[in-house]
């Protein structure tokens, strides 16, 4: 049975966050450089193996969290291991864009899940 | 300096319920969760859930679903946590804590309230 | 849920050596653990956040390694203060879970 209890963000509301947190922003986390992941491979976890390595910036807690709801309701979430680019690192803020962009298409699409 | 405060010890009965109140101080109350923790007999620690009092979402331990109730009051940048239908098993010392520097790691944490439930 | 297995429940030391105190998760946690320290009537204090970095204020002997399932708080040059309770948590996936905790005592 899925934990945590209450009921996980709805995409729509982490589309909200990341917007939150995008707007008017040329940087986050004082650019700070996470490894780039490949989206397509469970998008929940394998942006959350990346941003989970960001700390002191209280401006994306809120988005991990989000993230670590969602990866936590995943069958077996915690035994994959999403495809990581090794050899790429980005801004924060790209990779925060590049959920949101990826998000919004799921969200399009209806694929919820 | 971030400071947790707790209220004090309770003794209630079975079946009755309690309000554990966790009164913050030295940051910005919404920018971080409150996280609540319960620590039987000095044995190890069972996190009970958080609340984020930016909008007051809750996340909760499937353990605790129908034991705590966490909810805030942002003019006094106080957490509670309603405990209700207490039982022997319940006795135990509640923290409360926050996490600043990483997500979800309790660095900063209340003095613990110990609740003692018996008849 | 995600368990931490602390398999040492008790660990016998003396002042000057150095001990490691190991967590092994159920499954992979990437390096998602952190370590506390709690003496009794105290609240836990933590030590490491994601599997090796240390907060500020805590002494250099403690060290934390590993990543996947396997962890590490290793405790070189154990000092009397450091006699204490030590829980591992796994932050990677909710619930939170701790470990059961080891108990570092005197020889």
């Known amino acids: 049975s899925p934990s945590p209890v209450t009921p996980s963000p709805t995409l729509k509301e982490l589309i909200e966050e990341l917007v939150n947190i995008t707007q008017n922003q040329a940087s986050l986390c004082n650019g700070s450089m996470v490894w780039s992941v490949n989206l397509t491979a469970g998008m929940y976890c394998a942006a959350l193996e990346s941003l989970i390595n960001v700390s002191d910036c209280s401006a994306i807690q809120r988005t991990q969290r989000m993230l670590k709801a969602l990866c936590s309701q995943k069958p077996a979430a915690g035994q994959i291991s999403s495809e990581r680019s090794r050899d790429t690192k980005i801004e924060v803020i790209q990779l925060v864009k590049n959920l949101l962009t990826y998000v919004r298409g799921v969200y399009r699409h209806g694929n919820f899940r | 300096q971030v400071q947790l405060k707790q209220s004090g010890p309770e003794l209630v009965k079975p079946g009755a319920s309690v309000k554990v109140s966790c009164k913050t101080s030295g940051y910005s109350f919404t920018d971080y969760p409150i996280y609540w923790v319960r620590q039987s007999h000095g044995e190890s620690l069972e996190w009970i859930g958080y609340i984020d009092p930016y909008n007051g979402g809750t996340t909760y331990n499937q353990n605790f679903k129908d034991k705590a109730t966490l909810t805030v009051d942002k003019s006094s940048s106080t957490a509670f946590m309603h405990l209700y239908s207490l039982t022997s098993e319940d006795s135990a010392v509640y923290f409360c804590a926050t996490a600043v520097v990483a997500t979800d790691v309790m660095e900063n944490w209340g003095q613990g309230t110990s609740v003692t439930v018996s008849s | 849920d995600i368990v931490l297995t602390q398999s040492q429940k008790f660990m016998s030391t003396s002042v000057g050596d150095r001990v490691s105190i190991t967590c092994k998760a159920s499954?992979?946690?990437?390096?998602?653990v952190a370590w506390f320290q709690q003496k009794p009537g105290q609240s836990p204090k933590a030590l490491i956040y994601l599997a090796s970095n240390r907060y500020t204020g805590v002494p250099d002997h403690f060290t934390g390694s590993g990543s996947g399932t396997d962890f590490t708080l290793t405790i070189s040059n154990v000092q009397s203060e450091d006699l204490a309770d030590y829980f591992c948590?796994?932050?990677?996936?909710?619930?939170?879970?701790f470990g059961a905790g080891t108990k570092l005592e005197l020889k």
């Open positions: 948590l796994q932050h990677w996936n909710y619930p939170l879970t």
């Open positions: 499954q992979n946690v990437r390096n998602a």
